[in-house]
């Protein structure tokens, strides 16, 4: 029986009965928040073999092992993960071992086993046999291994029953509990699963099988399950579903998402039955189950019941997130706000069409309208009194409408009105007339030439850069000395710079009148010598990073023919030099034979250039004589050997480490002080733990259903 869609067992242990007939849980399994210690021995679910998403255990009192509950759980597919994890065991106060002795495969995702004070048999499980990559596993804060004394079956009787593998250079027996070995298939099977008798399964089987080389005898399927058979791909007229099985069209046509209160139904796309068309696709008509590619961003029509949507805060803008067509009128009235330009772009940046009018008034926080970065059509189906479809009134800091070199905007019907925008140059308005096709529609009073732009440098001269020099973290630039008609009017220069991976930035990006600005600013005084060109050294930059830079002259508000003259440069794009990359991450080595080592690593977090090759160095180390000094068969004399696992529990450090020579004489030494990098790593580690714990709590503590 397929159970699902996701099973949440909490508060009452008797809810476990819901699992009675399940062979596959299509979704997740949560067992959590059972605070009263119970006797779980009467609960056993031998039918359960597969969980398609993840298994989460959290604060279940009295549960000592999972082996009795789920003796045949073989595969956790990890089709959807819990914060990147397919198996999470967190704060299980009484759990003594995991005991999932038939667990053979976690197809996707890592494991997180944390804060289980009594949990042992963690170092005896070779997770690399179950997961593809163990580097993201997080096993921290459990019972210290030295207090566990984990022994695999037969070890004490000197008749070890389990097989050995190497983990962290330690060759040892692998088991789940004191009487359950970890199953390993013969090397002849390669990546294939095997039966209890070590016969190789069919290649389409995953985890295990009841008969060798038979695709109908698999416990779980490597790819997809259809009509009792494991298949590499779904047969014609069937579709992949939930990552593990094939369903027919009729099935897909009749299912709805339980996460939504609408009844939109699933779609078939690219051979899969899925809840929504993927990004960049849209349903092909209201009754269709199929997806077609969108031309540009996928359309999303938003409508305002009251016809006019007032945007006076980030919250009101949030309602328009993802909208591409707005049916109605936009009234923008942003007087203040924090980081307002980028917030508005985030929520309104996809709007392409407004069917009514657009009115911007008293928006003193706005410097530019570029946050409406995709607006291309104002239909003007509804207009303001006086037949206006674009109305801009009393915006004290508005300096730019849009970057007209990269913007096509059409106003299909209606006129434009501009008044009392003291920093908006009339030339900018005239440019908009030309681009939008409204030239000739406006009457004389619609664009006021006296109170628009009367406090702006509307006649701008161009500053030209004369030289640029770069190093790995510095840029030196110089520019022509600007000479206004009256030299005394030139006060200084301001250099603006920021990281710009693409050559598409504008002066007003991320800028608002409330102090937010995505540009870094540096003031540059005039050189005292009139023959020296002004310049700046920008330092503390990142290697191999493209920056955008422009310069503005700071001048007195000198009026000449009713206009203030100013000067600024074009935007210059310049890349810093390459540098040495940071160290490669997550270096792991393992031996797969007596003469080979396999070394794996991840690329550096800061490549600081184009990586062309890696250098791998190795050297032979003397054999550790410590290995031969102990009787490993004696339970009491197992030596405490620590392997760095990326975390340090303070209480585990019980004595000063002995070092060879310290201060000229042999003897105990204090631990070296932590480096900045180590301190930073510990800080990040603590932060990561907090983030996960918050995620866990936010996910599982939910209001009671009404």
């Amino acid at each position: 029986e397929i159970c699902g869609p996701g099973i949440d067992i909490r508060n009452d242990y008797q809810q476990l009965k819901r699992l009675e007939n399940c062979t596959v849980i299509e979704g997740y399994l949560h067992i959590l928040l059972i605070s009263k210690a119970e006797d779980y021995r009467s609960y056993r679910f031998p039918k359960l073999t597969v969980i398609t998403e993840y298994l989460l255990l959290f604060r279940v009192a009295g549960l000592e092992s999972l082996g009795d509950l789920f003796p045949n759980l073989t595969v956790i597919r990890g089709w959807k993960l819990f914060y990147n994890y397919a198996l999470v065991i967190f704060e299980m106060t009484n759990l003594k071992d995991i005991g999932l002795y038939n667990l053979r495969n976690i197809t996707r995702g890592a494991i997180r086993i944390e804060k289980n004070a009594d949990l042992c048999y963690l170092s005896t499980v070779d997770w690399s046999l179950i997961l593809d990559a163990v580097s993201n596993n997080y096993i921290v804060g459990n019972k210290p291994p030295k207090e566990c004394g984990d022994l695999c079956p037969g070890t004490m009787e000197e008749k070890p029953m389990c097989e050995k593998t190497t983990i962290n250079n330690e060759y040892n027996y692998r088991c789940w509990t004191t009487n359950r070995c970890q199953k390993m298939c013969p090397s002849t099977c390669g990546k294939r699963a095997c039966t209890e008798n070590n016969e190789c399964c069919h290649p389409e089987c995953l985890g295990s099988c009841s008969a060798p080389d038979n695709d109908t005898a698999c416990v779980a399927c490597r790819h997809y399950y259809y009509a009792g058979v494991c298949v590499p791909a779904c047969p014609p007229n069937t579709y992949r579903f939930e990552g593990w099985r094939c369903v027919d069209r009729d099935f897909c046509a009749n299912i709805l998402s339980a996460e939504s209160s609408d009844s939109e139904g699933f779609v078939i796309h690219d051979g899969e039955c899925m809840q929504e068309c993927p990004s960049g696709f849209i349903r092909n008509g209201s009754q269709s189950m199929y997806c077609i590619p969108c031309e540009g961003p996928c359309p999303k029509v938003c409508e305002e019941e009251k016809k006019t949507k007032t945007i006076d805060s980030v919250t009101s803008a949030q309602m328009l997130q993802g909208c591409t067509i707005f049916k109605g009128n936009l009234l923008i009235n942003i007087r203040r706000g924090n980081n307002i330009a980028s917030e508005l772009e985030n929520f309104m940046g996809l709007i392409e069409v407004v069917t009514g009018y657009v009115k911007i008034r008293h928006s003193h926080a706005l410097v530019s309208l570029s946050f409406l970065k995709n607006l291309r059509l104002i239909l003007g189906e509804e207009q303001l009194e006086g037949n206006y479809s674009f109305y801009v009134l009393d915006n004290q800091n508005l300096q730019q409408l849009w970057d007209w070199d990269h913007r096509n905007l059409t106003i299909k019907a209606g006129k434009m009105y501009f008044a009392f925008n003291p920093k908006l140059c009339v030339s900018e308005i005239y440019r908009m007339e030309e681009v939008t096709g409204t030239k000739g529609r406006q009457s004389k009073g619609d664009i006021n030439t006296r109170n628009n732009g009367e406090r702006a440098s509307c006649e701008s001269d161009v500053l030209h850069f004369t030289s640029t020099t770069t190093s790995k973290n510095r840029i030196i630039i110089t520019w022509h000395r600007y000479r206004p008609p009256d030299y005394r009017d030139l006060i200084s220069f301001t250099v603006y710079y920021k990281e710009a991976p693409f050559k598409n930035v504008t002066e007003y990006d991320g800028q608002d009148a409330c102090g937010s600005n995505s540009w870094n600013m540096v003031d540059v005084d005039l050189p005292p010598n009139k023959d020296v060109e002004p310049g700046i050294l920008l330092h503390g930059l990142k290697p191999w990073t493209q920056y955008a830079v422009y310069v503005k002259a700071v001048t007195l508000t000198m009026v000449e023919n009713d206009h203030i003259r100013g000067a600024k440069s074009e935007i210059l794009y310049i890349r810093t030099n390459a540098s040495v990359p940071s160290i490669p991450l997550d270096v792991l080595s393992a031996s797969n034979s007596s003469s080979q080592l396999i070394v794996k690593w991840n690329p550096p977090s800061l490549p600081n250039g184009n990586l062309s090759y890696y250098i791998v160095r190795w050297q032979r180390q003397p054999q550790d004589g410590y290995l031969y000094r102990h009787n490993y068969c004696s339970k009491d004399k197992i030596p405490i050997r620590k392997y760095a696992d990326g975390t340090i529990d303070i209480e585990e450090v019980t004595e000063n480490p002995k070092t060879e020579v310290c201060g000229g004489e042999k003897g105990p030494c204090c631990a070296c002080p932590k480096t900045e990098a180590e301190k930073q790593a510990e800080k990040e580690e603590a932060e990561y733990r907090k983030v996960f714990e918050n995620f866990l709590h936010n996910s599982i503590f939910v209001p009671r259903p009404e």
Epitope: P5, G6, E26, I255, L256, S261, D262, S263, S286, Q287
Partner: nanobody, 128 residues
């Protein structure tokens, strides 16, 4: 408070037609999926038809396909079921239901668990 009030039921001869209405209040009608269910005497409740809010996508039970038509008028907050070519086996109490979020996963449109609120029902009797 969510309210669903069905109307339009009654006695009709086989082959005849009826139009059921469901007046909704207490929620934003235009954003919720809706459905019609029915329960014949001594039988389980079964899904008849459903309709989505955003696109108007419709679903029908095999037994009514081609005879019944579901529709909605979001401006009037009303759900309709046009029933033509009625048969004796269509006799039942017809209920209107509104979708609700039910956590993760999926369900079939005709599963009652996907619906959070129900009307009181209207009786349709098909008899000669």
């Amino acid at each position: 408070e969510v309210q669903l009030v069905e109307s339009g039921g009654g006695l009709v001869q086989p082959g005849g037609s009826l139009r059921l209405s469901c007046a909704a209040s207490g929620f934003t009608f235009g954003t919720f999926g809706m459905a019609w269910f029915r329960q014949a005497p001594g039988k389980e409740r079964e899904g008849v038809s459903a309709i989505s809010a955003s696109s108007g996508r419709t679903y029908y039970a095999d037994s009514v396909k081609g005879r019944f038509t579901i529709s909605r008028d979001n401006s009037k907050n009303t759900l309709y079921l046009q029933m033509n070519s009625l048969r004796a086996e269509d006799t039942a109490v017809y209920y209107c239901a509104v979708r609700s979020k039910q956590g993760a996963g999926y369900g079939f449109w005709y599963e009652g668990r996907l619906y959070g609120y129900w009307g009181q029902g209207t009786l349709v009797t098909v008899s000669s």
